[in-house]
């Protein structure tokens, strides 16, 4: 079997949902010593980067300016050390937003409910679309999908304090082209004091995994690594 290097990690910097005409940044984290990184889009080569100096950098950033529906889709990356290529990263779905129109999000019976009540969100968009998406702020990976000609409903069932938070919806023209986001709807779920005090509220900052953790190796890091390796050998 052909030998390959471990697969790199691909991430979107800040978010995978990019407003049209704005810039997307994708990070490919591979290995120190990688001489070339390649970004692939829908199976075809999209961009190449050769880090300098390769032994000091463990990944690269790929910049995608002027985001549009032609650049929205599935991305992956690979890297090369010498003549040896890595396995392909997992796929990352890059979505273009702010296409066409803005939907309206409402909630029934209302934005303030009691724990155990049944809640349904309604997302409405008059322009031709059949798929709607509901996202909770701070949890943008947990996308709920629903279908309807002009309006879709998102039944939440009996809610708990864990459902508290801010929600937005999108109309989707295909999997990777979404409308403008709706205005947010804040769901407030009250429960008994015991539940309320224990229920963690969701963070409102962007998803913590949507950050690029690329590092530049310094001489000191190298010395520490060498020292650690020597110490491990002495301990054996």
């Amino acid at each position: 079997p052909k030998q390959t290097l471990p697969k790199p990690i691909i991430r979107a910097e800040s978010t995978y949902m990019v407003p049209k005409e704005k810039q997307a940044t994708l990070c490919c984290q591979g290995s120190y010593g990688a001489v070339e990184y390649q970004l692939h889009f829908e199976g075809s080569l999209f961009a190449v980067e050769r880090p300098k100096p390769p032994e000091r950098i463990n990944g690269v950033k790929f910049h995608i300016p002027d985001m549009n529906s032609r650049k929205a889709g599935r991305y992956s990356c690979i890297y090369r050390v010498g003549e040896l290529w890595s396995e392909r990263s997992d796929l990352l779905d890059l979505v273009v937003t702010e296409m066409y129109d803005t939907p309206t999000l409402s909630v029934h019976p209302g934005p303030e409910v009691t724990s155990g009540e049944k809640v349904t969100f309604y997302c409405r968009l008059d322009t031709a679309t059949s798929m709607f998406l509901l996202l909770k702020e701070g949890r943008s990976r947990d996308v709920q999908r629903s279908y309807g000609k002009v309006q879709a409903e998102f039944p939440m069932g009996p809610v708990t304090t864990a459902h508290r938070g801010s929600y937005r919806c999108f109309g989707s023209y295909n999997n990777y082209a979404w409308s403008f986001p709706s205005e947010p709807v804040k769901l407030l779920v009250t429960g008994d004091i015991e539940n309320t005090s224990l229920a963690p509220t969701d963070p409102t900052f962007p998803d913590s995994w949507d950050t690029c953790l690329l590092t530049r190796e310094t001489g000191l890091q190298k010395d520490l690594a060498l020292w650690d390796h020597t110490a491990q050998n002495l301990l054996r």
Epitope: A47, V48, I64
Partner: nanobody, 119 residues
């Protein structure tokens, strides 16, 4: 514009860009042969890193002159199958040293020049 050249001959294409963002642009050359899809030829990053299609590697050279806002494609050992309309393109703005290979990455395009290689 039409360029006629003998098989085995050489030719240099140039593409001048307007505006002062040229130095921060990544540039590329693409070509489209009659009845075929547009294909990638060569690209150059802001820092002069280059990438070539396998079909032109060793025969074509891409370069840029930021002072003249111009990108060049030096073509040698030309073959009949190199006959196509050649387009220059730019990705503006870019950061870092990305070399762009996919046509979807490019947001500015030249009008094209026909290169005919006589067998």
């Amino acid at each position: 514009e039409v360029q006629l050249v003998e098989s085995g001959g050489s030719l240099r294409l140039s593409c001048a860009a307007s505006g002062r963002t040229f130095a921060s642009a990544a540039m590329g050359w693409f070509r489209q042969a009659p009845g075929k899809e547009r294909e990638f030829v060569a690209a150059i990053s802001r820092s002069d890193d280059t990438y070539y299609a396998d079909s032109v590697k060793g025969r074509f050279t891409i370069s840029r002159d930021n002072a003249k806002n111009t990108v060049y494609l030096q073509m040698s050992s030309l073959r009949a199958e190199d006959t196509a309309v050649y387009y220059c393109a730019a990705v503006v703005p870019t950061y870092g040293n990305n070399i762009y290979v996919h046509s979807a990455a490019y947001n500015y395009w030249g009008q094209g020049t026909l290169v005919t290689v006589k067998p």
